[in-house]
């Protein structure tokens, strides 16, 4: 008797490894014999598709070499014209040993930046990714994290992060290792020992000493009053990534000597500078009686701080006042090192206005000092912590040169704006007008120039001077 088809063995979920064989069985009872068709994700599987084998009158579907794209729902449909067609469905879950699809590569990175070593993986179940540094498992911390993607992210890269890394992808079916890659950490040139200033007699011999470090080891060049050193002998030695340079001079004139340490990072260079003044006891230029002259500021460092076309006082006790004063700002900044985002613009304004003082032209050009109240605002409000550190270092004799003493004013010795408002200069930046604020160009710091944050704008808050201020 005719009998409608009945599927006696419903399809089940099949787990299969990539490149293995997977078989679905769809046992059917019926009379006459049914026609059986197969679909994957509702798309008909063609009888002549060479990736499949259909046997036992269509009751067995075999995938000959499973690929990860074979994942999906497979259905068999049986129909013999008696009654309706019947269908059974089952899923194919493609299991896959871990595979590293994007392995890490060798990386050269500058200290302080962020490094990302890629490690993208495939596998089912999804592999977990861990990293090995040298021979030991890498521990995550606040700086070092394995991302969801498997990549290793290192914030604020340190010298000790350099080394050999490999990633490990693991699931229940196996483990895959990447090849070993190298993370090389490069470090900006930094001056460890700045040359010291000297006050000597005419015809003396002086040795200036400058020590620098960095990765790769920097080279040191010496500059005299803005030009390459024309005389004197230089001796250099390198040990443990530290370069030591000694410049021996025969002194016949005063000058500003700058040690410049430079190293290369790819196509870019980093430099660090430190300067020392050589002055000659009782030496003065006979043709100049006054201490300086007024001129428009033409430098770079204080461009963002000083008023456009500002008339500044250039001190002729230096052989090349513009170059010397510009370097003083650089050197002072190097000694301030990292300061807070509130302190930095205030300190910039103070340094620039103190070293390049406003100039009152006349028969005798006169520098106009900063008003005491503005100096105190920087010292006590905006840079309280930094100022304390600097004063402590001064008292303990930790500064190698005396140059910072020239660049940071002693507030108590400055005139008050309450005595004579025209006798001292105000710092417009302490009224915090955001629009004037720019980043200084890179300075003597071994780090690249950093972002200067927005400061309180004049529309939101204002600096003022306490009227009850009493002299100290």
């Amino acid at each position: 008797l005719p009998k409608a088809p009945v599927i006696t063995t419903p399809l089940e979920t099949v787990d299969a490894l990539v490149e293995e064989v997977a078989t679905f069985m769809c046992a059917v009872e019926s009379y006459p014999q049914p026609e059986i068709s197969w679909t994957r994700n509702k798309i008909l599987i063609k009888l002549f598709d060479t990736r499949y084998s259909i046997r036992e009158n269509g009751q067995l579907l075999t995938i000959l070499s499973v690929e990860d794209s074979d994942d999906g729902i497979y259905c068999c449909t049986a129909n013999n014209g008696v009654g309706g067609a019947v269908e059974s469905c089952g899923a194919l879950q493609v299991k896959m040993k871990p595979k590293i699809t994007r392995p890490p590569i060798n990386v050269k990175i500058i200290e302080g930046l962020k490094a990302v070593l890629p490690c993208t993986t495939m596998g089912n179940p999804k592999p977990s990714v861990s990293w090995i540094k040298g021979d030991s498992p890498l521990r995550e911390n606040s700086r070092i994290a394995v991302l969801e993607s498997g990549s290793l992210r290192i914030h604020n890269v340190q010298k000790e992060d350099a080394g050999q890394y490999r990633c490990v992808a693991k699931n229940s079916l196996g483990t895959a290792y990447s090849k070993v890659v190298k993370l090389e950490v490069e470090v900006f040139a930094r001056i460890l020992r700045a040359p010291e200033s000297h006050n000597v007699t005419f015809g003396s011999f002086v040795t200036l000493h400058c020590t620098a470090t960095g990765i790769p080891v920097p080279t040191i060049t010496w500059i005299e009053n803005g030009n390459a050193v024309s005389s004197g002998s230089i001796q250099e030695s390198v040990k443990d990534r530290v370069i030591d340079s000694r410049l021996q001079l025969f002194i016949t004139k005063p000058g500003l000597y700058t040690c410049i340490a430079t190293n290369k990072h790819g196509e870019k260079f980093s430099t660090a500078k430190a300067a020392a003044t050589i002055s000659i006891a009782e030496w003065s230029k006979p043709q100049k009686d006054n201490k300086g002259y007024c001129a428009q500021y033409r430098g770079e460092v204080c461009n963002a701080v000083l008023a456009k076309d500002a008339l500044v006082f250039l001190n002729t006790s230096y052989a090349d006042p513009e170059e010397a004063q510009e370097l003083l700002v650089h050197t002072a900044w190097n000694e301030l090192k990292v300061v807070s985002p509130v302190c930095r613009p205030a300190a910039e304004a103070l340094l620039c206005n103190h070293i390049f003082q406003e100039c009152s032209p006349g028969v005798v050009p006169t520098p106009i000092p900063i008003c005491r109240e503005y100096c105190l605002a920087v010292k006590e409000l905006f840079c309280a912590k930094e100022w304390l550190v600097m004063e402590e270092k001064t008292h303990r004799g930790l500064y190698r040169s005396e140059m910072h003493l020239l660049s940071v004013p002693e507030c108590s010795k400055l005139p008050s704006m309450h005595w004579d408002p025209t006798a001292c200069a105000r710092l417009p930046h302490l009224d915090y007008n955001k629009e004037n604020l720019k980043t200084f160009p890179p300075m003597t710091s071994s780090k690249p120039s950093v972002d200067i944050p927005n400061l309180p704008s004049s529309s939101s808050s204002s600096f003022s001077v306490s009227p009850t201020y009493s002299m100290t």
Epitope: S340, P341, E380, C383, Y432, P453, L455, S461, S464, S466
Partner: antibody, heavy 119, light 113 residues
Framework: EVQLLESGGGLVQPGGSLRLSCAAS????????MSWVRQAPGKGLEWVSV????????YYADSVKGHFTISRDNSKNTLYLQMNSLRAEDTAVYYC????????????WGRGTLVTVSS | DIVMTQSPDSLAVSLGERATINCKSS????????????LAWYQQRPGQPPKLLIY???TRESGVPDRFSGSGSGTDFTLTISSLQAEDVAIYYC?????????FGQGTKVEIK
Amino acid sequence: EVQLLESGGGLVQPGGSLRLSCAASGFTFNSSAMSWVRQAPGKGLEWVSVISGSGGSTYYADSVKGHFTISRDNSKNTLYLQMNSLRAEDTAVYYCAKKELGDWYFDLWGRGTLVTVSS
Amino acid sequence: DIVMTQSPDSLAVSLGERATINCKSSQSVLYSSNNKNYLAWYQQRPGQPPKLLIYWASTRESGVPDRFSGSGSGTDFTLTISSLQAEDVAIYYCQQYYSIPPTFGQGTKVEIK
């Protein structure tokens, strides 16, 4: 015990004046920058002013500039806020707070004093 | 000025459960020179003054229980109370001190469900 205690709040008519005091104890007052922070009823916190440890430098929020004056007497370990030309929007609890050295967060607060400006 | 925005405005959490408060700044408060986030969190219990809980975004003030923790960097920050206690019912404020004037979030009220 380290503490700050405000006083001087009260009801005042618009245009009137009031002087708040804050007595400090238990820490080195003359080396600490001090601030006033206010909180309008049911509202959030608003920073008002700061004064350096020596009293030589002050700084104000724009909303109070010109009609509030911050001062201190280090011999009495006391901080002051002179409030002139008061307006309804100055109604708030006024807290004095010690500023962390070099950073602008506040590690010690007084209990506050309520200033109500109303006719 | 930097604008600080907290979410949610209020939340109710069962005792012993985790409470999470978010704070977003209108510009980054991460200073690249020292890799520090200039952000603090305060707790203000009913009728009390604010109390400093966390500074530098994740450093607990001494005496603050370790169930309070801060995280985040740049513009997005989170204060987490890992297991809410009855005494944690309060309004919590974030504050940036990256630029002057220092500014606070509008506050998030934490209650017991």
